[in-house]
């Protein structure tokens, strides 16, 4: 639970607290912002981001956004509150343990986006369909 | 019974450094993830630092990073934070934290200190 001697709440800057009242915790994220990338054509890629950083607010997840353009490729890694929108579009995925990279619609450009919540989980992204938790052989493993 | 002591804090001018001290007594010290977490006045937690145990793995978060410096000496049981050109910003209670997964996925039990006022100002 929270410490009695720490302030609870001020000026409505909310100690964010779990169902069970203890103080959570901010997650790690990888926090390069936007850097060129390599990545293409793969079914996974690790980030190349040596910054692993805590994040801000205890709500917030890890974001990982790739895009490719007549120029280049670039990887963006960041922590962001899911319940904000992200490059305009929802963190529909935040609750996921891995970065499951999905196409969004952006137009001159190949986009795609994923969030996650474990630790540094968007170090690795996942673009490979066989990934996605649709997949039958996966939920057994999952449940075995 | 669970302790942690925090020292060091005090006034110091912008561009100034402090090393703030955690005693921990009552648990394994070495085998725990350590936290110096802040609250400024006025304002929620900032959790600024962790150092994970074993393989003493550190963290930062971005206000801090390049500044600061979390270690820990396991044989003295005592946790440390480095501030180096402190800000006025900087300002805040500092406490050290400890949490241990309770083996339930997802949650914690966290410990933590009575805290040290750090003043930056001139």
């Known amino acids: 639970t929270i410490p009695p001697h720490v302030q609870k709440s001020v000026n409505n800057d909310m100690i964010v607290t779990d169902n069970n009242g203890a103080v959570k915790f901010p997650q790690l994220c990888k926090f390069c912002d936007v850097r060129f990338s390599t990545c293409d054509n793969q079914k996974s890629c690790m980030s190349n981001c040596s910054i692993t950083s805590i994040c801000e607010k205890p709500q917030e997840v890890c974001v990982a956004v790739w895009r490719k353009n007549d120029e280049n490729i670039t990887l963006e890694t960041v922590c962001h509150d899911p319940k904000l929108p992200y490059h305009d579009f929802i963190l529909e995925d935040a609750a996921s343990p891995k970065c499951i990279m999905k196409e969004k619609k952006k137009p001159g450009e190949t986009f795609f986006m994923c969030s996650c919540s474990s630790d540094e989980c968007n170090d690795n992204i996942i673009f490979s369909e066989e990934y996605n938790t649709s997949n039958p052989d996966l939920l057994l493993v999952i449940f075995q | 019974e669970v302790q942690l002591l925090e020292s060091g804090g005090g006034l110091v001018q912008p561009g100034g450094s402090l090393r703030l001290s955690c005693a921990a007594s009552?648990?394994?010290?070495?085998?725990?993830q350590m936290w110096w977490v802040r609250q400024a006045p006025g304002k929620g937690l900032e959790f600024v630092s962790?150092?994970?145990?074993?393989?003493?793995?550190?963290y930062y978060a971005n206000s801090v990073r390049g500044r600061f410096t979390i270690s820990r000496d396991n044989s003295k049981n005592t946790l440390y934070l480095q501030m180096n050109s402190l800000r006025a910003e900087d300002t805040a209670v500092y406490y050290c934290?400890?949490?241990?997964?309770?083996?339930?996925?997802?949650?914690?039990?966290?410990?933590w200190g009575q805290g040290t006022l750090v003043t930056v100002s001139s």
């Open positions: 934290a400890k949490r241990r997964p309770t083996g339930v996925s997802g949650t914690f039990y966290d410990y």
């Open positions: 009552g648990f394994t010290f070495g085998t725990e």
């Open positions: 962790r150092i994970d145990s074993p393989g003493g793995r550190t």
